[in-house]
Structure formats: C-alpha cells, structure tokens
Amino acid sequence: AGVFELQIHSFGPGPGPGAPRSPCSARLPCRLFFRVCLKPGLSEEAAESPCALGAALSARGPVYTEQPGAPAPDLPLPDGLLQVPFRDAWPGTFSFIIETWREELGDQIGGPAWSLLARVAGRRRLAAGGPWARDIQRAGAWELRFSYRARCEPPAVGTACTRLCRPRSAPSRCGPGLRPCAPLEDECEAPLVCRAGCSPEHGFCEQPGECRCLEGWTGPLCTVPVSTSSCLSPRGPSSATTGCLVPGPGPCDGNPCANGGSCSETPRSFECTCPRGFYGLRCEVSGVTCADGPCFNGGLCVGGADPDSAYICHCPPGFQGSNCEKRVDRCSLQPCRNGGLCLDLGHALRCRCRAGFAGPRCEHDLDDCAGRACANGGTCVEGGGAHRCSCALGFGGRDCRERADPCAARPCAHGGRCYAHFSGLVCACAPGYMGARCEFPVHPDGASALPAAPPGLRPGDPQRYL
C-alpha cells in the first residue's frame, strides 16, 4: 500500500505565440482546481475509462480576476498535494490524466459553473520510494508544470511497496533468511503475508497477497483437495502429473479482482469482494464518493454515501456526462414542434412559435378559423397554421372585404380585352381567337381546334367567363 502524490507547480500560458486569453475576467472571476486520474500499466485508454489506480480532486484555488489588458499570467493554484492512495502493489508503470477545471464565480444563473480548461495525459515508469519526478505537459496554448512521486505506507517498502518491514526484534541482526530493510537499516524485512485465508498447510506465496497451492490442492485458498489422492506428495508446487486429475483453470485463477479485492467462485463465474473505496465487477473503479462533490454544474449526487458504493450524478437539463461536466445544446434535440424557433436562454428553453401554433413547445395547433369570419360569402379554410378565406367571385383580400378587380391579373390571352362584369369578367377576343379566356385559335376554315363556340356566340364575339 502507498500513496501517489502530485504537486502542481504552475498552470499558465505556454511559450510561443498565441497566448491564451485569461480564463477569468472582472465580470467573471474564477478559480482553478485539478483532477488526477491514474491507471495501471501503459494503457492508452479513453479519458472516460475507470481510474483503476485511483483518482483525486484538489481543493479550489484562490479567486482570480483578470487585470484588463494584461496577458494571462500563471494562475493562482490550490494549496497542497493531490494524493491518490493505492492499496495494492505500486505497478511501476502507470498512465495519468490531469485535468484543469475552471470554476466561474460570476453572478450567472445557477451559481458557480465548471468547465474543463485543459487535459493532459501521459504514460510513465516510476519506482515507489524514489525522488520527486518533474514534468511539463502542454495542452493547446496552456502549460502545466508538476512533480509526482509514489511513496509506500509503512510497513511496506520497496519499489513496488510489496516488501514489509518490522522493527528488529534483536539489536544486532534480522531473523533467518530476512534482510535489513534499506533505507531503514534498523528494521527488518518481514515474512510475506499471503492472501487472507490462504491455507497454511496447503498454500504458500512468493508475492504478498497471492496463494499458490501445493500439489494435490486447488481453489483460491488451496482448501479443495484434488480428487485423485494417489497424486498427493508432501511438497512442491502444483503440477499436472501423469495419472492425476487436475482441474482446469478456475474463474478466480490469476485473481481477476483489482485493487486488493478478494475473489470467490460462484456456480457460474466469480465474485469480487472489494476493499473500502473501490467498486465494480472487478473492483476496478476507485471510490470517489458523493462527499467528494463529483457532480458539476448543479448536478445532484445520488448514492455513494460511503466509499463502498458507487455514485451517479443526476444532471440538470442542459448538462450531461458522468459528472455533469458537458454542456448540451438543448436546441439540438429540436424540442420546438411545428417549425418553432428554439432559444436556449441558459436558465430556460423558449420556443418562438410560427403563426397558428402556441404552447411552450408550439405543440398546440390553433383553430385558425375560430372566431374568423370571411366577408361577402367567403368560406374559411384552415391550413399551415394560418387561416385563409376562399372568396366569392368579385371579392378578395385576407377576409374577402376587398372588391376584386377581376381584370387585374390580365386573364385574357392573345391580346383579348378584359371587361369587369357583375358576375365575373368578360374577355373580348382579338380576331382569330376564341374561348372564355381567348385561349383557342380559330382555324382558317372556320372550324375551331377545341370546343365549338356555344350557340349564339360567333367566333370573335366577347365571351362571358362565368
């Protein structure tokens, strides 16, 4: 067991052109805080994957207000170290993500708001117990300078915190087979501690926390005899001797439980009993709890009242992500119906409705003709969110109140002359044309191409259009 420690030295503009604008202003004072996420091995996992080695949040830094016109300086930092305790051996190689968050303190609706300013990641080799390692990482125009180390918690020592030390029982030397503990020369290496419950008769260990079985015994704690008894021999690691029945690999072989979780076989699979502060199928998720305030932007932390249980964040509308850290464009969900215009005001969504629609989401189709009278014998027709009057002959306009000039649209073709008439319009056709709108040519032989002129009307006579 031990602690990974991270010391942030500075966060500010990196070298070169394009210095970033200060994240704070007189109108929006802000302060910084940091989050570190550790994963074992040299994994290139997504930022959202579990921080299997652990995670930590810093305190909030001092409030900072930009001086107008001044370039962004190094920003004031929170006091103290970020500490990530680890329960198991230190893996030696690890991946890290360090996030710089900005807490805006302006008088915006909703009180403080959080936004991610920068995220750096890297993969490193590090021995526990060594000196501080210094690092510089850049994210866009920002630069983060920091140091880190892993240190073992007594009684563990060594580059992986797997060796245990105890005070000497005798002043001069350590017990048989046990070496002094450098650099603590006045202490001695302690015997290995096998996995809890490992059978003292049938199991042994070469690394702390493991349980390897003597031949003829199996199970996670070496308590299950192999059924063919002729194979039993008093010593030696388990092996598949000819004629012996050695069971196939069990679900707990290799201990799938991370972070010091203990594995127990179930009829179908395995079950991990996780230490305090970890959860998940394999104890892979570190125990950030609701008390750590993990929900940003007004999110409510549900569950996770103690380190043994997970938490979830219920995010206010407009935010999402496991910590409510991502702002959502709520208008992208197209909440306004019937062609309404969406406005995300931050504190609320508003829909500006097209004519003929109403309601918070423009969901109500107004009865366009309700209370609408079309004058002069016109009839009301609903459609497209607006009423329309179909007017009687001789009338026009939105409500059929205007007397129409039936000749305004030049309805008579081929040079015919239009006359307004009480029942509509009349076209006086030019020579050679006939029809209600003078649309048909008269053939030279006197036969018309299309319907014959009605009785009593000669070609060329004015035609009344009914």
Epitope: E103, C295, G298, L300, G359
Partner: antibody
C-alpha cells in the same frame, strides 16, 4: 410565469393510497425536473421525490418503499402516489419545479392539505 | 444524509435591524449547493438564495447569503415588516435533498 396546481382528495383513510396530480401551465414539463415536497401542520419541509420527463426519478429513502411518481407529458402533469398512509402523512403537499441551475425549487404550487383520518 | 441545523429557532428583532440566520450542515455541502427560502403563513415557500450566495430573480438586495463547507448564513440587512416570517435552508449537493428545521423571525 409558470403556474403549478395540485389536485386530489383532501381526505384519505388510513392504510389507503394518497394520489395527487400537479398540472403545469405556461411551461413545458419536458424542460425541467418536477418534485413533491410536504409540510406537516406547524412543522418543517420534507422532500418526497422528483422526476424528469425521461423517466429519471429519485425518492427520499424514508418514504421510498411507499412512494411512486410518474409524469404525463401529453397532459403536462406529474403525479404522486403514497401508499399505506397513516396520520403521520397528514400534511400540506406542494408540487414544485426544480431549477435548471441545480436541485433547488424555483417555483411552487400553492399546496393542498391532505388529512389522513378515518 | 446531510442534516441541516438552523439556529436560532426564533429570532426576535425590530424592523430596520439586521438579521443573521445560521444553517449548519452535518457534512460539507459540495460546491456551496445551498438554497434559502422564505415562507409566509398559509403560503408556499419562495426561493431567496441559491448557490449559497446568488439572489433569485425579484428578491430585494437586503437579502444576502454567504458561507461554504458546513457553515452558511442568510443576512437581512434591514428588516422590513413583511420579513417577519419563517426561513428554511436546503442543500442540493447530495441526495436526499434535505431542509433545515427553519428559523422564525418575529417582531420584538
């Protein structure tokens, strides 16, 4: 301005189920979380439950086994059911809108008194 | 759950005086997720302050909030006649949402 109106019986017999509905006007129920809070006569406020149109809900652990909350977006309403009531459930029941800035209550109904008595 | 303890239970003051109401949490309220409400007799509560110190729309500037962690304060700089009512605090950082027991401000 959003308006919330509680409705439901003012008198419920012990061991029966209390049912209340909150009708929301001038706002879309899909834009906010909605909650129920109660206040026994002469006492303080107690949060009961909240719901979002998507179905996300949360309950006060002290009442969870007896409470259910539901939402009807088509009617712009949400409802509360509290089963196996006793005299201790006598209270003014408020429906309220939860702010988009956090889980506090920025608009309240005027409240409805529910008395549990035989 | 986070328990909120308001003190005093009753505050006796005269109009024009300054009122200081306290709300103490049993554990830290993350990110100052604390609100204050005012409740007049026979009415629903009304939001005054959220985020520990931000005034809600339409709230007179004689009301102000402060504090962080476990200790929060509502201050009424000059008590108006209509301010002699009951005040509640509420935390909204960790479920379940919880209210304080209330402080009654009465005329001396």
């Amino acid at each position: 301005q959003v308006q919330l109106q509680e409705s439901g019986p003012g008198l419920v017999k012990p061991s029966e189920t209390l049912s209340l509905t909150c009708t929301v006007s001038s706002d879309s129920i899909s834009s906010y979380y909605w909650s129920w809070i109660r206040q026994p006569p002469g006492k303080g406020l107690e949060w009961i439950s909240y719901i979002y149109y998507s179905g996300i809900s949360n309950y006060n652990p002290s009442l969870k086994s007896r409470v259910s909350i539901s939402v009807d977006t088509s009617k712009n309403q949400f409802s509360l059911r509290l089963s196996s009531v006793t005299a201790a459930d006598t209270a003014v029941y408020y429906c309220a809108r939860i702010s988009v800035a956090g889980f506090f209550f920025d608009n309240w109904g005027q409240g409805t008194l529910v008395t549990v008595s035989s | 759950e986070i328990m909120l303890t308001q003190s005093p239970d009753t505050l006796s003051l005269s109009p024009g005086e300054r009122a200081t109401l306290s709300c103490r949490a049993s554990q830290s309220v993350s990110s100052s997720y604390l609100a204050w409400y005012q409740q007049k007799p026979g009415q629903a509560p009304r939001l005054l302050i959220y985020g520990a110190s931000s005034r809600a729309a339409g709230v007179p500037d004689r009301f102000s909030g402060s504090g962080s962690g476990t200790d929060f304060t509502l201050t009424i700089s000059r008590l108006a006649p209509e301010d002699f009512v009951v005040y509640y605090c509420q935390q909204y950082g960790i479920s379940p949402l919880t209210f304080g027991g209330g402080t009654k401000v009465e005329i001396k």
